[in-house]
């Protein structure tokens, strides 16, 4: 499950360049854009993935901007600054010196300001609500079967421990997946819920980040689950700080 030795590729991140120049001639993979070494046995951080996405040549980008329906991440794509561990830096700025603070999933959580803006800490997103609407089917899915398949998907495809899948709600045609992971719950080696949600979001859009693995084929008792829209809501451990003007 690490970088594949035989053909030296990264199973968990196609946005990498790999070569057998690691210790002992082992396959080592680096993320496009940042050049940072990535652990191919687990998900790559969302920050490095966004950076790689922005660095890809425009004509080679088979990926699309997040749809305008996204309610929370409505700033869309940007070229983020990542720390040496691949996490988002708390303060992000663009080329015109406009700056803002982000949470651990890279979503803006303050008004935009200038270079004097201070972001004291990276605030953790501890609760993610993934809201899906599935295409019409002959009948509703069985809730417990749907619950089981989605928990298994997050465990087996995204390597997210089932204890972080707080709940799966279903009222046809809406499915809600709740991911919860406090700072104190996340142990070394645990996949971050933000990274799992991002991989899932890209899978749902048909833009799988996995190398050589088939696209997402989600079935419940053999019946295909086809998603026609996705909304993702992020809740931070510390509430965001927006001015009243933005809220009106």
């Amino acid at each position: 499950h690490t970088a594949a030795q035989d053909n030296c590729t990264c199973p968990t991140n196609k946005m990498t360049v790999c070569s057998p120049d690691g210790p002992g001639g082992r396959c080592q993979c680096r993320a496009l854009g940042s050049g940072m070494a990535v652990d191919c046995s687990t998900l790559t951080s969302k920050c490095l993935l966004l950076k790689a996405r922005m660095s890809a040549p425009k004509n080679a980008r088979t990926l699309v901007r997040p749809s305008e329906h996204a309610l929370v991440d409505n700033d869309g794509l940007y070229d983020p600054d990542c720390d040496p561990e691949g996490r988002f830096k708390a303060r992000q700025c663009n080329q015109t010196s406009v700056c803002w603070c982000v949470n651990s999933v890279g979503v803006r959580r303050t008004d935009k300001g200038d270079l004097s803006l201070r972001c004291d800490e990276l605030v953790r997103t501890h609760h993610i609500l993934i809201d899906l609407r599935h295409r019409p089917t002959a009948g509703a899915f069985n809730h417990s079967d749907l619950d089981a398949e989605l928990r298994r998907l997050f465990r087996e495809r995204y390597r997210l421990h089932p204890k972080f899948v707080a709940a799966v709600h279903y009222e046809q045609p809406t499915i809600q997946i709740e991911l919860r992971q406090n700072t104190s719950q996340k142990a070394a080696g645990d996949v971050d819920i933000g990274d799992a949600a991002y991989y899932f979001e890209r899978d749902i859009k048909g833009e799988s980040l996995f190398q050589g693995r088939g696209g997402l084929d989600l079935r419940v008792r053999g019946e295909p689950l086809q998603v026609e829209r996705t909304l993702i809501y992020y809740l931070d451990e510390i509430p965001p700080k927006f001015s009243m003007k933005r809220l009106t």
């Epitope: 499950h1 417990s144 398949e149 928990r151 298994r152 465990r155 087996e156 089932p162 204890k163 080696g189």
Partner: antibody, heavy 118, light 109 residues
Framework: QSLEESGGDLVQPGASLTLTCKAS????????MLWVRQAPGKGLEWIGC???????TYFASWATGRFAISKTSSTTVTLQMTSLTAADTATYFC?????????????WGPGTLVTVSS | YDMTQTPASVSAAVGGTVTIKCQAS??????LAWYQQKPGQPPKLLIY???DLASGVPSRFKGSGSGTEYTLTISDLECDDAATYYC????????????FGGGTEVVVK
């Protein structure tokens, strides 16, 4: 840390039986619990699994419908079996995964013997 | 995800080497374990992630492979290595008949 199965018995064909797996020394909620069986002189056969957090269950294709797994207390998991036949005669093991997201079984009970015979 | 294990039985002298192969019907991304089982006992985890030794397992046991092809090699055989060995795919529990291979009996002469 340990696991111990109980409830194995000699039963008639067509009967039902519930096996219990008792866990000691660890928090079940951080793990998946699996049941595996082994017929006399045969290999290991995976039956099913429960994700303790969430309570979702998964079964080998041959076991779906006739077997059920549930968490019955903070330290016990059960395997319910119905419509038993001679082919179900085996030692039944409960096992725990290693707490990661793979299904490596690093803790096993000693097993309990189920004999189905008239 | 069927697991095919060969051979069913293998015999070697003390100090010798045995090789057991396991083939998965689909790519399991190196999520493979090897277990040792002795009569009257539950299986014991030897190797995980295809090549990593479980705690307390001697380095005479070596796992290798990727994709669909995996191998367990036991070198410098000891009498205590006489047992049945099983491979297990640890990638998925969805739509499978059995996660385990059929087993290989190792006889030490």
């Amino acid at each position: 840390q340990s696991l111990e199965e109980s409830g194995g018995d000699l039963v008639q064909p067509g009967a039902s039986l519930t096996l219990t797996c008792k866990a000691s020394g660890f928090d079940l909620n951080n793990y998946a619990m699996l049941w595996v069986r082994q017929a006399p002189g045969k290999g290991l056969e995976w039956i099913g699994c429960i994700y303790i957090s969430g309570g979702t269950t998964y079964f080998a294709s041959w076991a779906t419908g006739r077997f059920a797994i549930s968490k019955t207390s903070s330290t016990t998991v059960t395997l319910q079996m119905t419509s038993l036949t001679a082919a179900d005669t085996a030692t039944y093991f409960c096992a725990r995964d290693d707490g990661t997201t793979s299904y490596y079984l690093n803790l096993w009970g000693p097993g309990t013997l189920v004999t189905v015979s008239s | 995800y069927d697991m095919t294990q060969t051979p069913a039985s293998v015999s070697a002298a003390v100090g010798g080497t045995v090789t057991i192969k396991c083939q998965a019907s689909e790519d399991i991304y190196s999520l493979l374990a090897w277990y040792q089982q002795k009569p009257g006992q539950p299986p014991k985890l030897l190797i995980y992630d295809a090549s990593d030794l479980a705690s307390g397992v001697p380095s005479r046991f070596k796992g290798s492979g990727s994709g669909t092809e995996y191998t367990l090699t036991i070198s410098d055989l000891e009498c205590d290595d006489a047992a049945t060995y099983y491979c297990q795919q640890a990638y998925t529990i969805g739509n499978i008949d059995n996660a385990f291979g059929g087993g290989t009996e190792v006889v030490v002469k």
